[in-house]
Amino acid sequence: PASLAGCYSAPLKGPLWTCLLLCAALRTLLASPSNEVNLLDSRTVLGDLGWIAFPKNGWEEIGEVDENYAPIHTYQVCKVMEQNQNNWLLTSWISNEGASRIFIELKFTLRDCNSLPGGLGTCKETFNMYYFESDDENGRNIKDNQYIKIDTIAADESFTELDLGDRVMKLNTEVRDVGPLSKKGFYLAFQDVGACIALVSVRVYYKKCPSVVRHLAVFPDTITGADSSQLLEVSGSCVNHSVTDDPPKMHCSAEGEWLVPIGKCMCKAGYEEKNGTCQVCRPGFFKASPHSQTCSKCPPHSYTHEEASTSCVCEKDYFRRESDPPTMACTRPPSAPRNAISNVNETSVFLEWIPPADTGGGKDVSYYILCKKCNSHAGVCEECGGHVRYLPQQIGLKNTSVMMADPLAHTNYTFEIEAVNGVSDLSPGTRQYVSVNVTTNQAAPSPVTNVKKGKIAKNSISLSWQEPDRPNGIILEYEIKYFEKDQETSYTIIKSKETTITAEGLKPASVYVFQIRARTAAGYGVFSRRFEFETTPVFGASNDQSQIP
């Protein structure tokens, strides 16, 4: 730099007013936004900047200091006396660090020519800024025709009265951008053509979209593109313990802003989002799916002692169906229904009860009716089978009553009413049911179906049969009706308390038709189908124990 002897520089001591004002103004402006990466900031360089003034008596560095006596690199030129000024200030080489578009922020004071005394005639109010790309750190070239003009810089607020105002110096700030850059670095140059300028700060930076976590995806620092309208698509990577089914992307704008987010990451099962990270679910909490937002407290009757639980374990004697989501409470089989009552008539049995005291914790209680037919003599019961109809149904009954149609008459039934829910079949414990014992009323018996011929002679026929399938009560007697074939109107009735009879006084070699019915206290049943038997001829032998089909 030019010699400072005899010039108006601040001595490197004491709190110089102008310097303090500059410092205060600069300090407030010193912090760069997070999307700007400085390649050069003359305010932060402690030693020699290594800039060159050409000619030597043009730009001069003035020794401003801040309150800590750290130097501020301020370059001043005020060659307003002489015509045809052409003073150059050349920076050292500046690496562009891979950026293809850079920004130059100048802070300067530019004195209004009107504030200078009349008679100067050469005063200007602008200066020029140039750049020169180079891969060579030592290739500073002071031939001005090598440099490309960036712009002519004028003050937005050139202070006519050197306006320090309320002791706060107004610095003009101008920002220009340059691109696309193709080499490793560049030099800047400032050309004075006869202005009165103090160049207080030169900051060269590029813009980046700063590393950010958005929607649980990490997007890395991304240098903006060379084109001022360019959007760079950047893929994000999911933060720890997160997953995606829609890969996250964002677009980095030329201004260093993240735009147009696409896709997202979600905290995986067992983790929840907190402050942009996936935090483990605490014991007692779970998250079953990445699509859930937060860890939830274990549902009723379940627990987890682990971190990062994706489900909770059911307490002892509590269960969850496989089809149940992990968010559902664990339940246990309900207790038995209560206060079951029956009402019997000739054609049906009506049962009614109230719900169990303990539903097991769920709302899905239904009822199952098990019908057992019991032999009163032997005390042995067997399932009723298909002869009973249940109205409305036997299984999955939602209401607390059921009607059984077509029960057998004069039969001992045990109806077991069991309350069930979705986990009843998972429980190894005993069934919980209430029993109702019912004896149906007697009814006319069903027809006799199985008749066997016994001894047949020329004048008699002996028969035997089995009790009807459904006696529907106690068989008091059987009535046997028989007649000679085709002589139906002339029939004979025999009554018998046994299941065998012998019809006597029959004609030899004649066909007889037999029909049998049983009687209970409720009355006679219908006659059986017709059974035909033939007496033997006079000379024939007797025939016994042949079953008539």
Partner: antibody, heavy 121, light 106 residues
Framework: QVQLLQSGAEVKKPGASVKVPCKAS????????MSWVRQAPGQGLEWMGW????????TYAQGFTGRFVFSLDTSVSTAYLQISSLKAEDTAVYYC??????????????WGQGTLVTVSS | EIVLTQSPATLSVSPGERATLSCRAS??????LAWYQQKPGQAPRLLIY???TWATGIPDRFSASGSGTDFTLTISRVEPEDFAVYYC????????FGQGTKVEIK
């Protein structure tokens, strides 16, 4: 080092003329303006005006037009103050002072030792 | 023409004491003000320009402030060599001096 050298004292009669030289050294003469300041005996400083050493263009303060002329000889880095038709009230020490213009302000940073001009009959 | 009025005309202080000199302009001169020191038989010496900026080699016991019409020069601890006459001067299209303040030994 930078200095301005003025001539010794002058005694003149009323109506006469005087030409006070101010020789600069230690810097480029044409890069700084030159100002003239008058100080009457026992009085304060009075700015007379200045001359652009690059263009030769002078600027005069109120009350210093007509009889007062600023001039230059850049070949010898010298500025001149010429006063014609001298009057008794022109008796004073006349200082040349180099003017420095900066973005932060202006000032006369280097002064000559002064030339006493006495006008007496 | 802008008139500068300095006060007091004379200021008597003891060495080591603080001295405060005032300069008032008839109209705003913003910060276009300089201060000079003149000792008997010597040329003036530039102390401050731009209302508050030290010239080269000026001790930091001298400080100045103000803008617009009211300006102050302060000598924090007067040294024996500081006894002199102090002038303020405004600069713009036309320049003028104040009438001066004499700082003398008390």
């Amino acid at each position: 080092q930078v200095q301005l050298l003025q001539s010794g004292a002058e005694v003149k009669k009323p109506g006469a003329s005087v030409k006070v030289p101010c020789k600069a050294s230690g810097y480029t003469f044409t890069s700084r303006a030159m100002s003239w300041v008058r100080q009457a005996p026992g009085q304060g400083l009075e700015w007379m005006g200045w001359i652009n050493t690059n263009t030769g263009n002078p600027t005069y303060a109120q009350g210093f037009t007509g009889r007062f002329v600023f001039s230059l000889d850049t070949s010898v880095s010298t500025a001149y103050l010429q006063i014609s038709s001298l009057k008794a009230e022109d008796t004073a020490v006349y200082y040349c002072a180099r003017v420095r213009f900066t973005v932060y302000g202006d000032g006369m940073d280097v002064w000559g030792q002064g030339t006493l001009v006495t006008v007496s009959s | 023409e802008i008139v500068l009025t300095q006060s007091p005309a004379t200021l008597s202080v003891s060495p080591g004491e603080r001295a405060t000199l005032s300069c008032r302009a008839s109209q705003s001169v913003s910060s276009n003000l300089a201060w000079y020191q003149q000792k008997p038989g010597q040329a003036p010496r530039l102390l401050i320009y731009g209302a508050s900026t030290w010239a080269t080699g000026i001790p930091d016991r001298f400080s100045a402030s103000g803008s617009g019409t009211d300006f102050t020069l302060t000598i924090s601890r007067v040294e024996p060599e500081d006894f002199a006459v102090y002038y303020c001067q405004q600069y713009g299209p036309s320049w003028t001096f104040g009438q001066g303040t004499k700082v003398e030994i008390k």
